[in-house]
């Protein structure tokens, strides 16, 4: 049985050119994460395996970065990236847990953070 | 460099068994999922199973469910295939393939032949 | 499972023509989709994983694209050492499984 939940940074919102950090958290389970994967809508962008360590897709080499943690960090972001992400927990026994981020990337210099959810 | 050699292929009768093996070289065993394809004379390619590198976790072809057995020796960088209750649709060249991060099949071995005929 | 239609099943082309063969998936991968090419004889050979990446090695003429359901192998300039079969593979889910293969033949 998935007891487990996935906590997320939710919806968030950051300047055209600058950085953002994702993140998503598993709790109230005892289940090994072996690996987490980060999609874009259809695009595979990272990888951290809990034995091979992270792969970054060679397309975003540039702009994404392993870390903090499981978490992946976006930079030089364009309007472009606005979407949503996902983040997949690959888990022994339990199975695959995912959460679901929006992002939103704004011209202007206001951008405010969303508050945090969660996903079961 | 990344080795990968199978052993154990050859004729066996039907209902019969046999187990290939496939010694992995050049990398850290351990570290990758490892997979079993499969691929009958002048036909495609079909995944047969994988096992995690832990060995914990392992999943099946319904073709084969309960009849094969996936497993592995990280001491001895050598994955195993237990082929029980053999049919004559299991005749192929059996492949041994490194999966990292469980994506890909990046390097595969040259394939050893498994002959179910009476 | 997820089935894995690829099209054409052979092809007749020459030294230097633009090959372009197809993946279709019967459900949304995202872009877990591979590229082998496999000669008579031999094992086959990583291409394109993750739908659009070059493994190490690749020549550059090899390029993938293509998320979802829909996928596609582009040989830019087809050499003679490109003749041969390649095969799709989906890695979203357990079982694994490939297409059908498309054999490249010389015209």
């Known amino acids: 049985m998935m007891t487990g939940t996935i906590e997320t940074t939710g919806n968030i919102s950051a300047e055209k050119g600058g950085s953002i950090i994702l993140q998503c958290h598993l709790s109230s389970t005892t289940a090994q994460v072996t690996q987490v994967n980060w999609e874009q809508q259809d695009q595979l962008l990272a990888i951290c395996n809990a034995d091979l360590g992270w792969h970054i897709s060679p397309s975003f080499k540039d702009r994404v970065a392993p870390g903090p943690g499981l978490g992946l960090t976006l930079q030089s972001l364009t309007v472009n990236d606005t979407g949503e992400y996902f983040c997949i927990y690959h888990t022994y026994p339990d199975g695959t847990y995912t959460g679901r981020i929006f992002l939103e990337v704004l011209e202007s210099s206001v951008a405010e953070h969303g508050a945090r959810f969660q996903i079961p | 460099e990344v080795q990968l050699l199978e052993s154990g292929g050859g004729l066996v009768q039907p209902g019969g068994s046999l187990r290939l093996s496939c010694a992995a070289s050049?990398?850290?065993?351990?570290?990758?999922?490892m997979n079993w394809v499969r691929q009958a004379p002048g036909k495609g390619l079909e995944w047969v199973a994988s096992?995690?590198?832990?060995?914990?976790?392992?999943s099946y072809a319904d073709s084969v469910k309960g009849r094969f057995t996936i497993s592995r020796d990280n001491s001895k960088n050598t994955l195993y295939l237990q082929m029980n209750s053999l049919r004559a649709e299991d005749t192929a060249v059996y492949y041994c393939?490194?999966?990292?991060?469980?994506?890909?099949?990046?390097?595969w071995g040259q394939g050893t032949l498994v002959t179910v005929s009476s | 499972d997820i089935q894995m239609t690829q099209s054409p099943s052979s092809l007749s082309a020459s030294v230097g023509d633009r090959v372009t063969i197809t993946c279709r998936a019967s459900?949304?991968?995202?872009?877990?989709l591979n590229w082998y090419q496999q000669k008579p004889g031999k094992a086959p050979k990583l291409l394109i994983y993750?739908?659009?990446s070059l493994q190490s090695g690749v020549p550059s003429r090899f390029s993938g694209s293509g998320s979802g359901t829909d996928f596609t192998l582009t040989i830019s300039s087809l050499q003679p050492e490109d003749f041969a079969t390649y095969y799709c593979?989906?890695?979203?889910?357990?079982?694994?499984?490939f297409g059908g293969g498309t054999k490249v033949e010389i015209k």
């Open positions: 393939a490194r999966g990292p991060y469980d994506t890909w099949l990046d390097y």
């Open positions: 050049g990398f850290t065993f351990s570290s990758y999922s």
């Open positions: 096992i995690k590198s832990s060995s914990s976790y392992t």
């Open positions: 459900q949304s991968i995202s872009s877990y």
């Open positions: 993750a739908a659009s």
């Open positions: 593979q989906q890695s979203y889910s357990t079982p694994l499984t």
